[in-house]
C-alpha cells in the first residue's frame, strides 16, 4: 500500500490577465471514488481557503458558482485554474487532497505552488 503523496509545481507565473494554472497530482493509497480538492493560500503564516471542489472519479470538478477556480480531473491528476488574480494575490497556493470515499479517509497536502502575479501596466494615454 503506497502512501498518500501530493505533488505540485514549485513556481507558476500568472498571465497578464491574472490567470494561473497548475497541476495537482496525488499518489493514492487506495481506489478512491470520491475526492475533495482544496486550494489554500498561505501568506504571513496565515492560511485561507481559496476554493474547494468534491468530485467523483471520472467526473468533472464542480466548484461553487462564485468560485475563482475551475478545474478538470484525469485519473489522479487535477488541473487547476485560478482566475482574477492581482499582484496582491502573489503567494503560496497549497493543494490539499482528501480521499473521502470509500473508507478509510486519507489526507494529502502538497508543498505549495508559489504564484507570482504582476499587474499589467496601464496603457499610455494617446495624443489623439
Amino acid at each position: 500500500c503506497k502512501a498518500m503523496h501530493v505533488a505540485q509545481p514549485a513556481v507558476v507565473l500568472a498571465s497578464s490577465r491574472g490567470i494561473a494554472s497548475f497541476v495537482c497530482e496525488y499518489a493514492s493509497p487506495g481506489k478512491a471514488t470520491e475526492v475533495r480538492v482544496t486550494v489554500l493560500r498561505q501568506a504571513d503564516s496565515q492560511v485561507t481557503e481559496v476554493c474547494a471542489a468534491t468530485y467523483m472519479m471520472g467526473n468533472e470538478l464542480t466548484f461553487l458558482d462564485d468560485s475563482i477556480c475551475t478545474g478538470t480531473s484525469s485519473g489522479n491528476q487535477v488541473n487547476l485554474t485560478i482566475q482574477g488574480l492581482r499582484a496582491m494575490d502573489t503567494g503560496l497556493y497549497i493543494c490539499k487532497v482528501e480521499l473521502m470515499y470509500p473508507p478509510p479517509y486519507y489526507l494529502g497536502i502538497g508543498n505549495g505552488t508559489q504564484i507570482y502575479v504582476i499587474d499589467p501596466e496601464p496603457c499610455p494615454d494617446s495624443d489623439f
Partner: antibody, heavy 118, light 107 residues
C-alpha cells in the same frame, strides 16, 4: 471569534440513548470537518467520530461503530452525536472539535460529561 | 488502524529545563502529526500541526519535528504554565488515533 458549545450530557442507564449537540459560531461551519473526541475519567483522549463538510462522509472509531451516529445541520451550525446502546465504558467528557484548515483539531468546546450508570 | 505510542509516559522537570517528548506511529503518516496540551479540567489545545507548524498564538519555545513514523515535541525552556499532559495525534487516515499522553510535572 470561533466558539463551540456542547450540550446534552447527563446520567443515563446502560442500554439507553443520549443525544449530544454542539453549537458552532464565528466561522463558516460548512467549510470544516467536525469531530467528537472523548476522555474517560483519569484517562487519555480517544477520537470518536468525524463528519466532513456537507455531511455525506462520516467515520467512526471501532469502539462506537454501529451504536453512535454523527450528524450536522449546516443551516443551523450544529453538530450532533446520537449515542445508542450506551455502556459503562462510554462514560467520559465528550468534546466537539473543529478540523483545522490544514490539519489538527484547532478549536475545542468545553466538553460535556456523559455518565452511564445503573 | 494506525497505533500511536508516546514516551515517556511521565516526566519530572524544572522551570527552564529543555523537555523532549517522542511519538511513534505504527506506520508512516508522512507529516500529519499534531501535538496538544491539556491541563486538568480543561479542553485540549492545539500546539503543533503537520509535525512542525506552530499553531497561531502558541509560544515559540514549543517546536515539533519528524516525518514518517518518528516525531518529537520540544519545549526549549519549560515555563510554570507548561506543566500539563501532552498528546500526539495522527490525522493522516481514519481512525484519527491519539497517543496515550505524556504528563509533565514539577520536579
Amino acid at each position: 471569534q470561533v466558539q463551540l458549545v456542547e450540550s446534552g450530557g447527563g446520567v443515563v442507564q446502560p442500554g439507553r440513548s443520549l443525544r449530544l449537540s454542539c453549537a458552532a459560531s464565528g466561522f463558516t461551519f460548512s467549510r470544516y470537518g467536525m469531530h467528537w473526541v472523548r476522555q474517560a475519567p483519569g484517562k487519555g483522549l480517544e477520537w470518536v467520530a468525524v463528519i466532513w463538510y456537507d455531511g455525506n462522509n462520516k467515520y467512526y472509531a471501532d469502539s462506537v461503530k454501529g451504536r453512535f451516529t454523527i450528524s450536522r445541520d449546516n443551516s443551523k451550525n450544529t453538530l450532533n452525536l446520537q449515542m445508542n446502546s450506551l455502556r459503562a465504558e462510554d462514560t467520559a467528557v465528550y468534546y466537539c472539535a473543529r478540523a483545522g484548515i490544514l490539519t489538527g483539531l484547532d478549536y475545542w468546546g468545553q466538553g460535556t460529561l456523559v455518565t452511564v450508570s445503573s | 488502524d494506525i497505533q500511536m505510542t508516546q514516551s515517556p509516559s511521565s516526566l519530572s522537570a524544572s522551570v527552564g529545563d529543555r523537555v523532549t517528548i517522542t511519538c511513534r506511529a505504527s506506520q508512516s503518516i508522512s507529516s500529519y502529526l499534531n501535538w496538544y496540551q491539556q491541563k486538568p479540567g480543561k479542553a485540549p489545545k492545539l500546539l503543533i500541526y503537520a509535525a512542525s507548524s506552530l499553531q497561531s498564538g502558541v509560544p515559540s519555545r514549543f517546536s515539533g519535528s519528524g516525518s514518517g513514523t518518528d516525531f518529537t515535541l520540544t519545549i526549549s525552556s519549560l515555563q510554570p504554565e507548561d506543566f500539563a499532559t501532552y498528546y500526539c495525534q495522527q490525522s493522516y487516515s481514519t481512525p484519527f488515533t491519539f497517543g496515550p499522553g505524556t504528563k509533565v510535572d514539577i520536579k
